[in-house]
Amino acid sequence: LIIGFGISGRHSITVTTVASAGNIGEDGILSCTFEPDIKLSDIVIQWLKEGVLGLVHEFKEGKDELSEQDEMFRGRTAVFADQVIVGNASLRLKNVQLTDAGTYKCYIITSKGKGNANLEYKTGAFSMPEVNVDYNASSETLRCEAPRWFPQPTVVWASQVDQGANFSEVSNTSFELNSENVTMKVVSVLYNVTINNTYSCMIENDIAKATGDIKVTESEIKRRSHLQLLNSKAS
């Protein structure tokens, strides 16, 4: 969490951002909130990126002002216009690119004063894994698949019954480059699986951690997946 305060002249206002991560090819949110003003026309929002000459986005007098917008963000940004009045300056970034990673500044001017806060934005790819019984395998085997990851993640298997066991000797993980030549499909196979046990396939890089769980009994298979973004620190 980064909380910035305005400086000199007018009173300072509190601006708060949250470090976040964007999934390549999907839409992302750069979070920023501020002390609201009663008049929309008095609010100016500027998003800037370190190392970029033009603005990422500007919103003033109740509408977008994109004449100074940098080419790399053309047609890809939007604020939540109806939420600006309540102090939401978050930026929606369409079709996140690897090059969108970096330090962003959310700069706010209102009738109460000025303020800004920086935000670290990471980009990569992450997806939910699905763990299934491999019915076509020559022994008791589970298969964990996740379609899009970048940078290359680590994959670790765990089991409820054999807690603390190292499954590296009985698993095999492969990474297959996807057609856009950046992200990769992750496939991990676990052998020597036993009935009446719950197994977890954990995929992690510096952006996200995802887990696929599978409970295996002699009569049915139950699955569950969850994904968590890492380093979501507020500023």
Epitope: S138, S139, I195, I221
Partner: antibody, heavy 118, light 106 residues
Framework: DVQLQESGPGLVKPSQSLSLTCSVT?????????WSWIRQFPGNKLEWMGF???????SYNPSLKNRISITRDTSKNQFFLRLNSVTKEDTATYYC???????????WGQGTTLTVSS | ENVLTQSPAIMSASPGEKVTMTCSAS?????MHWYQQKSSTSPKLWIY???KLASGVPGRFSGSGSGNSYSLTISSMEAEDVATYYC?????????FGSGTKLEIK
């Protein structure tokens, strides 16, 4: 108690398709397990043909290539075997059975005899 | 596929005699299961998970083994044991049966 009952035509002509039905009582086929077809040739050799799982997933014996299809009707608690382009080598007694994951068949039907002949 | 080879193919034993039949797997398996089949009936689960007796199976039967080698033993042959016994592996795709051991009585 779980009971399985096969039914079918008894006689099929070469190159035609065979269709068999397995009716299950005493257990819902959507609640669990792997609902299988097995056949026994005249020389007594047993062959697992394939299954449809409680969630509708299929697995087939590669020896049957693209000739086999196992489907189900959950409202009737039945599952079906369809085998295309049959030859005399498909003459056998066909059993349906309930399979436990990675383990055994615990319940079998009594079998239905199928002859492929012109 | 995992080929299960049963031996002998046919055997006969006198009442009271100890009987052992074997099942050899071309690839290692976690468990072996055995079925008994009498003429014109469907196979019955006889021994499961290598060594557990199915419901109603007499205590004179036992199963053992691991990896690639498994066996079924009858401690004292009885007339009602006349049948064909099949081993089965249900863990490796495709699931496979042995060719059977036909047990006769002398």
């Amino acid at each position: 108690d779980v009971q399985l009952q096969e039914s079918g035509p008894g006689l099929v002509k070469p190159s035609q398709s065979l269709s068999l039905t397995c009716s299950v009582t005493g257990y819902s086929i959507t609640s669990g397990y792997f609902w299988s077809w097995i056949r026994q040739f005249p020389g007594n050799k047993l062959e697992w043909m394939g299954f449809i799982s409680y969630d509708g997933t299929n697995s087939y014996n590669p020896s049957l290539k693209n000739r086999i299809s196992i489907t189900r009707d959950t409202s009737k608690n039945q599952f079906f075997l369809r085998l295309n382009s049959v030859t005399k080598e498909d003459t056998a007694t066909y059993y349906c059975a309930r399979k436990l994951l990675w383990l055994r068949f615990d319940y079998w039907g009594q079998g239905t005899t199928l002859t492929v002949s012109s | 596929e995992n080929v299960l080879t049963q031996s002998p193919a046919i055997m006969s034993a006198s009442p009271g005699e100890k009987v052992t039949m074997t099942c050899s797997a071309s690839s290692s398996v976690s468990y072996m299961h055995w079925y008994q089949q009498k003429s014109s009936t469907s196979p019955k689960l006889w021994i499961y998970d290598t060594s557990k007796l199915a419901s109603g199976v007499p205590g004179r039967f036992s199963g053992s083994g691991s990896g690639n080698s498994y066996s079924l033993t009858i401690s004292s042959m009885e007339a009602e044991d006349v049948a064909t016994y099949y081993c089965f592996q249900g863990s490796g795709y495709p699931f496979t049966f042995g060719s059977g051991t036909k047990l006769e009585i002398k």
